[in-house]
Interface confidence: low
């Protein structure tokens, strides 16, 4: 199906920028992996690069305005021609849910005092209103609460006196047209306008004041322009060459408003001075290689020794990474393919341990399932041996850091019947439903 093709993908907002044009296939648009596309105007924007997770959205508002609730955020798998980590298809949402508390206490209503006395009538003639008030203090509200209803009420009052009506001008009527629209005619053009004393008319009994000033005014038409000449378009110029060497580009034609040139305030040519066309080089754009993440460190060993585990003997280990995605003469990955370091092996070594403090509370899990809970842990943490942190190399190479490697077997005193992990769980409260933000906009 044809798509709308854009030249940029804005990572921060997930929006497509720089519309190239429509009516092209996803495959043609994504000849350039820096481009992005939409299946329909205003729809979800997908970049042409390999799929990866977007940034997390901001946390949604707390599900309740007071006491403890929960809030959601999401991220989306965006990209083309592949899957995100966890074998997730582009367009898929992933959710996180956490506990929140906007305000510790919930508002409590207050009660009204009795009504105060009526204030005097608001006018001295005809009919007006009078008002009385009451206070929200019986009892006073708590935690941002309020009293139901209004703090004041009004009623009509009649002074039994007739009011005079003073005259006032209605707005000026329009100026009459000048006798000519261009300068140089036989008569000196004039324009006139008038107004009525009708907004309102002055009353007879009791007598109101008449409108001040004149009911009409006249002026000379000045600064009339010479008669205008409308502009006309010249022919379209040649089509510009395709400005790109790969993927899709945009060519342009131009024309000039000089056939004739507009004169004496005549209108400029209607329509566009330029028009564009999509040009297709049918050549894929180069794609630079990108390093995969580093692989696992190899076991910590020393040549000619069967095992150095649990001993103060430095060994060596290495890890590697792969340069992926290089296509169409793109740049190779910069940097080293292999990383080597010095190490002490503590693999399966029994070490004295100590209990950590409680971790912070984790996210609510599952974020979109029934009865989510959050947890925190205390871990039996191994105390590492006090081996030298560096080793001296052959002359001229200086000192090298040595890293502990391996999974030791920490030993802690039993805590709540556990030897390695103590976990505490708590339910998450007032959990909102997971809803696709794209669906909510429709």
């Amino acid at each position: 199906d044809p798509v709308l093709c854009f030249t940029q993908y804005e990572e921060s907002s997930g929006k497509c920028k720089g519309l190239l044009g429509g009516g092209v296939s996803v495959e043609d648009c994504c000849l350039n992996t820096a481009f992005a596309y939409q299946k329909r105007s205003g729809g979800l924007c997908q970049p042409c690069r390999s799929p990866r997770w977007s940034l997390w959205s901001t946390w949604a508002p707390c599900s309740v305005t007071c006491s403890e609730g929960s809030q959601l955020r999401y991220r989306r798998c965006v990209g083309w021609n592949g899957q995100c980590s966890g074998k997730v298809a582009p367009g898929t949402l992933e959710w996180q849910l956490q506990a929140c508390e906007d305000q510790q206490c919930c508002p409590e209503m207050g009660g009204w005092s009795g009504w105060g006395p009526w204030e005097p009538c608001s006018v001295t003639c005809s009919k007006g209103t009078r008002t009385r008030r009451r206070a929200c203090n019986h009892p006073a509200p708590k935690c941002g609460g309020h009293c139901p209803g209004q703090a004041q009420e009004s009623e009509a009052c009649d002074t039994q006196q007739v009011c005079p009506t003073h005259g006032a001008w209605a707005t000026w009527g329009p100026w009459t047209p000048c006798s000519a629209s261009c300068h140089g005619g036989p008569h000196e053009p004039k324009e006139t306008r008038s107004r009525k004393c009708s907004a309102p008319e002055p009353s007879q009994k009791p007598p109101g004041k008449p409108c001040p000033g004149l009911a009409y005014e006249q002026r000379r038409c000045t600064g009339l322009p010479p008669c205008p000449v409308a502009g006309g378009w010249g022919p379209w110029g040649p089509v510009s060459p395709c400005p790109v060497t790969c993927g899709l580009g945009q060519t342009m034609e131009q024309r000039t408003c000089n056939h004739p040139v507009p004169q004496h305030g005549g209108p400029f040519c209607a329509g566009d001075a330029t028009r564009t066309h999509i040009c297709n080089t049918a050549v894929p754009c180069p794609v630079d290689g990108e390093w995969d993440s580093w692989g696992e460190w190899s076991p910590c060993i020393r040549r000619n020794m069967k095992s150095i585990s649990c001993q103060e003997i430095p060994g060596q280990q290495s890890r590697g990474r792969t340069c992926r995605g290089r296509k169409f003469d793109g740049h190779r990955c910069a940097g080293q393919q292999q990383d080597i370091r010095h190490c002490y092996s503590i693999q399966h070594c029994p070490l004295k341990g100590s209990w950590s403090e409680w971790s912070t509370w984790g996210l609510c899990m599952p974020p979109c399932g029934p009865n989510p809970t959050r947890a925190r842990q205390r871990l039996c943490t191994p105390l590492l041996p006090k081996y030298p942190p560096t080793v001296s190399m052959v002359e001229g190479q200086g000192e090298k850091n040595v890293t502990f490697w391996g999974r030791p077997l920490p030993r802690c005193e039993e805590l709540q019947g556990q030897k390695l992990v103590v976990e505490e769980k708590r339910p998450c409260l007032h959990v909102p439903a997971c809803k696709d933000p794209e669906e909510e906009e429709l």
């Epitope: 992933e94 899990m365 599952p366 399932g369 997971c434 809803k435």
Partner: nanobody, 119 residues
Amino acid sequence: EVQLVESGGGLVQAGGSLRLSCAASGRISSIIHMAWYRQAPGKQRELVAEISRVGTTVYADSVKGRFTISRDDAKNTVTLQMNSLKPEDTAVYYCNALQYEKHGGADYWGQGTQVTVSS
């Protein structure tokens, strides 16, 4: 783990109808979206229709008004009713389940069922 088994594919003439069914088993309590995707020879796999846990649906523009997706939570099935079929609907149709676990989402796919629409 979640297992998905599709059924109901086959050969049909243009303008005819088919009903695809997908049965889910395993850890189905945490599934929030069920969907049908399709893949024609030499083309990308594309979304046909999707239904969320709360019943909201999304359809591809090319099938709107012709296909209907529904789910039966009691039987743990999702169904795609396909009417007014066209030759361009010919593809392998895959059932998909999106599950949210403690450490994020997981995608599960069925083996696929072939739908062929002849002109």
